[in-house]
């Protein structure tokens, strides 16, 4: 009778085991072990027992002890069970960003591991078990579907294998995959709202605002604002589930024409974009041209108003005839025209919007000098010893210099308060002089003496 010890062994893969083959007869003709495993016999006294060291056990095996005794041949098998933890425990790769409301399929693949009867695959969210299944197939695959929720944001999903050898007197061996961190997001189907000027003048600045509500997590949203090829650098303000990106846009003559303004919001692996056109225009203020800004009285003056070729102008409120970018008027300069404003108003339609510009010029009319009865009376009669202010106003542009002299030497104090004396009496020659010429006027002062009774 042949026996083997131990009859059952569980050992780690690549491990070694001592197997004892025994026989019940004292003088067996043969006693040995049959196995494909590398073996080494340990020398022992006696003929009816042999010990073998079996090494590098890679898979389950059933070495067989045999003996040949006088009463016949017999065999006994030992059962070697190899255990090893899986070589690969992996979650199938997934995009880290997943939209809320999507059904997400988690797939765990397990390669290797034995004994399979003791191997279980567990899918987890954090520490919460989602699914537990025995490992079947090579590679073993376990799947589960998760409906992505907002509160799953940042959750770690993992896959764990459990090789439970506790019933065999060993421990529970666990292997865990690298975690998959889920980033959940909500990007609404509505495109971002873009508020910007429809038209923008060259060498000016405009403000562009792009905003969107209903985002999650809003802090992860990327905003790209651009005008044509010019990337704008917005200041982004975040709300609970909204953002507002504000940027200044400067345009130059090179940008003139219709440009595309874009606002793109990227969140997770999705994006929403809004496009708008902005018309960049150049519109210098209209030109008011006077033949001469300063003319003498009686001179013919042409006032011209010129604007952008597509503009429509009015000159002093009168539309150009025909309607267009030029208007003019002719006038003979009079003193009343001195300081007169000529205003040219231009309207330019840019992409349906009306832009208004204005320019004003003043005409200077040189005239005079003038001395007339109204402003310089020819006769004054004043009581002696009274307080009087001689008044004589000369008119003209430029303002004339005025002197009133009696006998060429004695001045009349114009505009000053004086006590009337006999010396003041007489005829004065008032002379008004400017670059435009000279006029004279005689002014007589009569002094009334008081009557003594």
């Amino acid at each position: 009778q042949t026996s083997v010890s131990p009859s059952k062994v569980i050992l780690p893969r690549g491990g070694s085991v001592l197997v004892t083959c025994s026989t019940s007869c004292d003088q067996p003709k043969l006693l040995g072990i049959e196995t494909p495993l590398p073996k080494k016999e340990l020398l022992l006294p006696g003929n009816n027992r042999k010990v073998y060291e079996l090494s590098n056990v890679q898979e389950d095996s059933q070495p067989m002890c045999y003996s040949n005794c006088p009463d016949g041949q017999s065999t006994a098998k030992t059962f070697l069970t190899v255990y090893w933890t899986p070589e690969r425990v992996e979650l199938a790769p997934l995009p880290s960003w997943q939209p809320v409301g999507k059904n997400l399929t988690l797939r765990c693949q397990v390669e290797g591991g034995a004994p399979r009867a003791n191997l279980t695959v567990v899918l987890l969210r954090g520490e919460k078990e989602l699914k537990r299944e025995p490992a079947v197939g090579e590679p073993a695959e376990v799947t589960t579907t998760v409906l992505v929720r907002r509160d799953h944001h940042g959750a770690n999903f993992s896959c764990r294998t459990e090789l439970d050898l506790r019933p065999q007197g060993l421990e529970l061996f666990e292997n865990t995959s690298a975690p998959y961190q889920l980033q959940t997001f909500v990007l609404p189907a509505t495109p971002p709202q873009l508020v910007s000027p429809r038209v923008l003048e060259v060498d000016t600045q405009g403000t562009v605002v792009c905003s969107l509500d209903g985002l999650f997590p809003v802090s992860e949203a990327q905003v790209h604002l651009a005008l044509g090829d010019q990337r704008l650098n917005p200041t982004v303000t975040y709300g609970n589930d909204s953002f507002s990106a504000k940027a200044s846009v400067s345009v130059t003559a090179e940008d003139e024409g219709t440009q595309r303004l874009t606002c793109a919001v990227i969140l997770g692996n999705q994006s929403q974009e809004t496009l708008q056109t902005v018309t960049i225009y150049s519109f210098p203020a209209p030109n008011v041209i006077l033949t001469k800004p300063e003319v003498s009285e009686g001179t013919e003056v042409t006032v011209k108003c010129e604007a952008h070729p597509r503009a429509k102008v009015t000159l002093n409120g009168v539309p150009a005839q025909p309607l267009g970018p030029r208007a003019q008027l002719l006038l003979k300069a009079t003193p009343e025209d001195n300081g007169r404003s000529f205003s040219c108003s231009a309207t330019l339609e840019v992409a349906g919007q009306l832009i208004h510009k204005n320019q004003t010029r003043e005409l200077r009319v040189l005239y005079g000098p003038r001395l007339d009865e109204r402003d310089c009376p020819g006769n004054w009669t004043w009581p002696e010893n009274s307080q009087q202010t001689p008044m004589c106003q000369a008119w003209g542009n430029p303002l004339p210099e005025l002197k009133c002299l009696k006998d060429g030497t004695f001045p009349l104090p114009i505009g000053e308060s004086v006590t009337v004396t006999r010396d003041l009496e007489g005829t004065y020659l008032c002379r008004a002089r400017s670059t435009q010429g000279e006029v004279t006027r005689k002014v007589t002062v009569n002094v009334l003496s008081p009557r003594y009774e």
């Epitope: 038209v199 009015t314 002093n316 409120g317 539309p319 992409a351 919007q353 009306l354």
Partner: antibody, heavy 123, light 110 residues
Framework: QSVEESGGRLVTPGTPLTLTCTVS????????MSWVRQAPGKGLEWIGI??????TYYASWAKGRFTISKTSSTTVDLKITSPTTEDTATYFC???????????????????WGPGTLVTVSA | AYDMTQTPASVEVAVGGTVTIKCQAS??????LSWFHQKPGQPPKRLIY???TLASGVSSRFKGSGSGTQFTLTISGVESADAATYYC????????????FGGGTEVVVK
């Protein structure tokens, strides 16, 4: 000075229709002209405008559905490219250009309207 | 875009009373605003232009005011002939996609 629309009639959906606006007493080379419509019992709805130089602008809902063109110095057309029952309305043509003598600026203002022409779209 | 919001949508007023209609622009339109009224079967008729200037032949009972974004039309001493739908219209822009008219206010005279 006057404005008058013509061409309104009963059409089947999808049949293109052209309305004409005829002006007298002024020239279209000096004015912008707008088309406005009004569905039965509804408010005024601006369709689009044509400038003195022939540039056109449209309301967002009207783009691609309507075409405004100048056919002479006294006529402007509105083409409804593929009418639907929703296009049933009275269509008005209005002079849409004014200037303010105090500032000297031009602005949009519908100061002169036609009596309107009725378009009925029905199968 | 220049959105024009008109309030109220409808108002009832007794003969001799006063009615106020408001029009709000989403962006400044300076004073480029006109008011119209329209009676059934007729084209609109301009009452006021440049926010406050009375169109020729229009009764001085109609008064327009405001600038920028807020505008008001006031009808005082209401007559039965004033029963109509009133519209505001911005004169600042006719860009693509623009809103030109307010939604309208129906004035019912009792």
């Amino acid at each position: 000075q006057s404005v008058e629309e013509s061409g309104g009639r009963l059409v089947t959906p999808g049949t293109p229709l052209t309305l004409t606006c005829t002006v007298s007493g002024f020239s279209l080379s000096d004015y912008y002209m707008s088309w406005v419509r009004q569905a039965p019992g509804k408010g005024l709805e601006w369709i689009g405008i044509i400038s003195d130089s022939g540039s056109t602008y449209y309301a967002s809902w009207a783009k691609g559905r309507f075409t405004i063109s100048k056919t002479s110095s006294t006529t402007v057309d509105l083409k409804i490219t593929s009418p639907t029952t929703e296009d049933t309305a009275t269509y008005f043509c209005a002079r849409d250009w004014s200037y303010d003598s105090s500032s000297g600026y031009y602005y949009y203002d519908m100061d002169l309207w036609g009596p309107g022409t009725l378009v009925t779209v029905s199968a | 875009a220049y959105d024009m919001t008109q309030t109220p949508a409808s108002v009832e007023v007794a003969v001799g009373g006063t009615v106020t209609i408001k029009c709000q622009a989403s962006q400044s339109i300076n004073s480029w605003l006109s008011w119209f009224h329209q009676k059934p079967g007729q084209p609109p008729k301009r009452l006021i232009y440049k926010a406050s200037t009375l169109a020729s032949g229009v009764s001085s009972r109609f008064k327009g005011s405001g600038s920028g974004t807020q505008f008001t039309l006031t009808i005082s001493g209401v007559e039965s002939a004033d029963a109509a739908t009133y519209y505001c219209q911005q004169g600042y822009s006719r860009s693509d996609g623009e809103h030109v008219f307010g939604g309208g206010t129906e004035v019912v005279v009792k």
